[in-house]
C-alpha cells in the first residue's frame, strides 16, 4: 500500500478582504477510508472549517466534486474573507473508527494572511 500523504503546497496565502480564498489540499491515496476535514489552528481549541461528511458551511465550497469515488482533491474556497479569517489552515485525514473517527494524518498547513488592500 502507498502511504497516504497530505499535500498543502502553499505555506503562505495572501488574501484580500471581501475576496475569495482558495486553500489547496490533495491526498496521495484513498486509503484508509475516512473523511477529510479542514481546521483552523491546532490542538483542542482548533476551529472546524469544513467537514465533507456532514454539517453546514455556508461560506465554504469545494473545488472538486467530492462525490467522485476516486477524488483526491480536497481543496476548498472560502468566500467573503474578513480579518477574522487569518490563521493557519490544516486539511486532516481521519480514518474510520467506532464510535468516533480517528485522526490519521494532517497536512503541513497553509497560513492565511491579509495582503495589501486593493487600490
Amino acid at each position: 500500500e502507498e502511504e497516504l500523504q497530505m499535500i498543502q503546497p502553499e505555506k503562505l496565502l495572501l488574501v484580500t478582504v471581501g475576496k475569495t480564498a482558495t486553500l489547496h489540499c490533495t491526498v496521495t491515496s484513498l486509503l484508509p477510508v475516512g473523511p477529510v476535514l479542514w481546521f483552523r489552528g491546532v490542538g483542542p481549541g482548533r476551529e472546524l472549517i469544513y467537514n465533507q461528511k456532514e454539517g453546514h458551511f455556508p461560506r465554504v465550497t469545494t473545488v472538486s466534486d467530492l462525490t467522485k469515488r476516486n477524488n483526491m482533491d480536497f481543496s476548498i474556497r472560502i468566500s467573503s474573507i474578513t480579518p477574522a479569517d487569518v490563521g493557519t489552515y490544516y486539511c486532516v485525514k481521519f480514518r474510520k473508527g467506532s464510535p468516533e473517527n480517528v485522526e490519521f494524518k494532517s497536512g503541513p498547513g497553509t497560513e492565511m494572511a491579509l495582503g495589501a488592500k486593493p487600490s
Epitope: 486509503l31 484508509p32 477510508v33 466534486d65 462525490t67 476516486n70 474510520k96 467506532s98
Partner: antibody, heavy 118, light 107 residues
C-alpha cells in the same frame, strides 16, 4: 419529504432496450451521488452503477459494463439507466438509491419492475 | 464476497446479532438494509458502519472491526421481522457489494 420515484419498467423481449428514470424530490439532488440497484425474483440486492453528483464520473459492476449506462440531469432532478441488449437474467426490480458521503445508501425508491421475456 | 447467515430467529425482547464478514476494515464501509417483503423498497437501518438514520429506532445499532460488521437489534420486536442485507463500499475498487441476506424471524 424526500422521495425517489422510479419509472420506465415493463415487459421487453431479449435483445431490446429500456430506459429507466428516477425522479428525485425533497433534497438538493445536484449535491448527491446516486446509484442503481436491482433485485431479481427470489434473489438478493445487486449494485449496478453509480454516478457522481456532477455527473462526470460513472462506475459499473463488470456484468453490465458496456450494456448499461447511468446518467443524470440535475436541471430535472432526474437519474437514468439506459439498458441495452437485455436478457432474461436482467429481469428484476430496479431501485434508485441516494448515496451517503462514503458511497453507501441512505434512501431508496420504491422500485420499477423490468421483465425480459420472449 | 460478503457472507451472512441465511436466517436467525429470536423471541420478542431478545437481542439479535447478525454478522457480515468478508470486507477489509482498512478499505471498507458497511451498511445494513431492511426489506420487509421481496420487491418492496429497502430501508437503510445503518450506514457508515454504525450510523443510524434519524427515523430508525435506537434498538438498531451497528459496529465493525477487522473483516466483519455486526448489526445488533436490542429488544427485538415483531415488526422487525424482515430480510436484512449487509452492504459494503470498497474504497480500493470503487464497487458496492451486498450479502445474500439474513431472514429474521421473531417467534
Amino acid at each position: 419529504d424526500l422521495q425517489l420515484v422510479e419509472s420506465g419498467g415493463g415487459v421487453v423481449r431479449p435483445g431490446e432496450s429500456l430506459r429507466l428514470s428516477c425522479a428525485a424530490s425533497g433534497f438538493t439532488f445536484s449535491s448527491y451521488a446516486m446509484s442503481w440497484v436491482r433485485q431479481a425474483p427470489g434473489k438478493g440486492l445487486e449494485w449496478l452503477a453509480g454516478i457522481s453528483a456532477g455527473g462526470s464520473d460513472t462506475y459499473y459492476i463488470d456484468s453490465v459494463k458496456g450494456r448499461f449506462t447511468i446518467s443524470r440531469d440535475n436541471s430535472k432532478n432526474s437519474l437514468y439507466l439506459q439498458m441495452n441488449s437485455l436478457t432474461a437474467e436482467d429481469t428484476a426490480v430496479y431501485y434508485c438509491a441516494r448515496e451517503t458521503w462514503n458511497h453507501l445508501f441512505d434512501y431508496w425508491g420504491l422500485g420499477t419492475l423490468v421483465t425480459v421475456s420472449s | 464476497a460478503l457472507t451472512q447467515p441465511a436466517s436467525v430467529s429470536a423471541n420478542p425482547g431478545e437481542t439479535v446479532k447478525i454478522i457480515c464478514s468478508g470486507g477489509d476494515y482498512y478499505s471498507t464501509y458497511y451498511g445494513w438494509y431492511q426489506q420487509k417483503s421481496p420487491g418492496s423498497a429497502p430501508v437503510t437501518v445503518i450506514h457508515s458502519d454504525d450510523k443510524r438514520p434519524s427515523d430508525i429506532p435506537s434498538r438498531f445499532s451497528g459496529s465493525a472491526s477487522g473483516s466483519a460488521a455486526t448489526l445488533t437489534i436490542t429488544g427485538v420486536r415483531v415488526e422487525d421481522e424482515a430480510v436484512y442485507f449487509c452492504g459494503a463500499y470498497d474504497g480500493r475498487t470503487y464497487i458496492n457489494t451486498f450479502g445474500a441476506g439474513t431472514t429474521l424471524t421473531v417467534l
